[in-house]
């Protein structure tokens, strides 16, 4: 049986269970490599608290569908001698990146993973050519998620006081310089995730290879390397590579860009100091505050929440946007979409799409940007399931109360982006992380 | 406060079975993990049994197919059921709660002895 999610084989995924204390390693393609799973265990469940080993999915048992992969095993569940056996699951999404399996909870029989991938898309639009795993788990097994600097277009440009280079770069996966080809850029190579610009020219100085790295709790490594045996005539024949690290800062602090801090014969150090190199907890609720000791920051957006069937309105253009965030409220044109964006065609006003669900809701601080996601919403044509973006400005003398009101500011592959100013988004800094 | 009590343990025969109860008290029993350890005479503690907060269970190769965790939740409490006892299985058993916010609570024991 030919392997279901091609792009997704070549590395050993970790999906937690932080509540019980429990690493899961996944390989959807063969099995991973640990002993104590045995030697055709796809899903391999890793007690730390008691330091035992269980395999929870065997390769040889697997069975897919385009948005569902089964591992089962020969293992009983319920110790009575019945046909239950103990198996895996894992529903697949459309996502704009290779993504991560996360854990979503686990019965006596089923251990259920969900994961948003672009490997599960209907088209390849948001396929790279090279993407490595972008997430790691440290030693207390909280999960630093670099995918949201993931660029699907353009690059970062490197801060470096050479004036006749620019070094380009993208994070776990290689520029693509069709969707956005800004004039620097045009020139790279494909496959290249560091591009090194110099006059009219430019050169690949290094491709994703492996995924990211923790080296210590609060640093981050990814390496680059040039695959082709060919050398650069400025590089005194050494081959090119570029190491990353991403530092997560001591305390709450604006966002940087990345910094050249070494080149020697092409080799070059890049640090970047971003908080989304921070474990996820530190950065994200589920909920529409952030707040505690674990977050050094007060945020509280649940004062925007609509009630009695109003909705906040924006305008764009060929839609009205209906947005009730922060609660769980029906947006009366949605039809019962459970929907916290509802995008409404003007000239057809029976064209109702949810843009992002009420119960799929992120609230992101980091790097000084505070951001509501709602994703889950209704798929477009690539399978990707409509999302919205909500990128959140501080401004006391905001009207309606306060509140201010959300202002469209444009789409890309479905996914809606808003900014809203209000008195509420005035973040309240602690100062001991 | 928060505490563990173990009871049911006792002498029984090779093959006989016993059913040990751990009650909880001052936690969320539900979003607790629960895992049976025991220590036999002269030997280091030893994982016996977990029932996770989602419920999944595992068991350790020595006691698979014969002990089976189980919990009521509204009677805050977690079950061994232990069937076929051989001598080996003789231990003083401990039950263990843990969630991402407390620490390690353990209860302080009961005995099982299994012996014609």
């Known amino acids: 049986q030919a392997a279901p999610f091609p792009e997704l084989c070549s590395y050993t995924w970790e999906a937690v269970d932080t509540k019980n204390n429990v690493l899961y390693k996944i390989n959807i393609c063969g099995s991973v490599d640990i002993v104590q799973c045995g030697p055709s265990s796809a899903v391999c469940m890793h007690d730390l608290k008691t330091r035992t080993y269980h395999s929870v999915g065997d390769s040889v048992l697997r069975s897919a569908t385009r948005s569902l992969l089964e591992f089962n095993t020969t293992v009983s569940c319920d110790q009575q001698g019945t046909n239950h056996r103990v198996q895996s699951s894992i529903a697949f999404l459309c996502g704009k990146t290779l993504g991560t399996p996360e854990f979503v909870t686990a019965t006596e029989c089923v251990h259920y993973f969900e994961w948003r991938t672009t490997a599960a898309c209907k088209k390849d639009i948001f396929k790279a050519n090279k993407e490595v795993p972008c997430y790691v788990f440290d030693e207390e097994l909280r999960k630093h998620d670099l995918n949201p600097l993931i660029k699907l277009s353009g690059a970062y440009l490197v801060d470096d006081s050479d004036p006749d280079t620019s070094l380009f770069i993208n994070v776990c996966r290689d520029i693509d310089t069709l969707r956005d080809p800004g004039s620097q850029l045009r020139a790279c190579p494909p496959g290249t995730a560091a591009c090194l610009v110099r006059g009219h020219q430019a050169f690949d100085v290094g491709q994703p290879r492996d995924g990211l790295k923790v080296v210590r709790k609060d640093r981050l490594v990814l390496s680059y390397v040039r695959e082709e045996a060919g050398k650069l005539d400025f590089c005194d024949g050494h081959s090119p590579a570029v190491t990353i690290t991403f530092v997560c800062p001591s305390e709450r602090r604006e966002g940087t860009i990345p910094k050249l801090t070494a080149k020697s014969n092409c080799r070059y150090e890049i640090e970047w100091i971003t908080e989304y190199a921070c474990h996820r907890d530190y950065l994200e609720s589920k909920t529409c505050s952030l707040s505690g000791e674990q977050q050094d920051v007060s945020i509280d957006l649940t004062p925007l929440a609509q009630s009695g069937g109003s909705s906040y309105i924006s305008d764009g253009k060929e839609y009205l946007f209906y947005l009730n965030v922060c609660g769980e409220t029906e947006i009366q044109f949605c039809n019962k979409k459970q929907a916290a964006v509802c995008q409404v065609k003007k000239s057809d006003t029976s064209q109702v799409k949810a843009a992002g669900r009420y119960h799929n809701q992120t609230l992101r601080y980091s790097d000084g940007f505070l951001t509501l996601i709602y994703f889950g919403g209704d798929e477009c044509s690539s399978g990707f399931q409509r999302m919205s973006v909500i990128n959140f400005e501080c401004n006391k003398t905001a009207g309606n109360d306060g509140k201010g009101t959300p202002v469209f500011t444009g789409e890309v592959d479905c996914t809606y982006f808003f900014t809203w100013d209000t008195e509420y988004a005035c973040v309240h800094h602690h100062h001991h992380h | 406060d928060v505490q563990l009590v173990e009871s049911g343990g006792g002498l029984v025969q090779p093959g006989g079975s016993l059913r040990l109860s751990c009650a909880a008290s001052?936690?969320?029993?539900?979003?607790?993990?629960m895992d049976w350890y025991r220590q036999a005479p002269g030997k280091q503690r030893e994982w016996v049994a977990t029932?996770?907060?989602?419920?999944?269970?595992t068991y350790a190769d020595s006691v698979k197919g014969r002990f089976t965790i189980s919990r009521d939740n509204a009677k805050n409490t977690v079950y061994l059921q232990m069937n076929s006892l051989r001598p080996e299985d003789t231990a003083v058993y401990y039950c263990?709660?843990?969630?991402?916010?407390?620490?390690?609570?353990w209860g302080q024991g009961t005995l099982v002895t299994v012996s014609s």
């Open positions: 029932l996770a907060s989602y419920g999944w269970k």
């Open positions: 001052g936690i969320i029993f539900s979003d607790n993990r």
């Open positions: 263990k709660a843990s969630s991402p916010v407390l620490n390690d609570i």
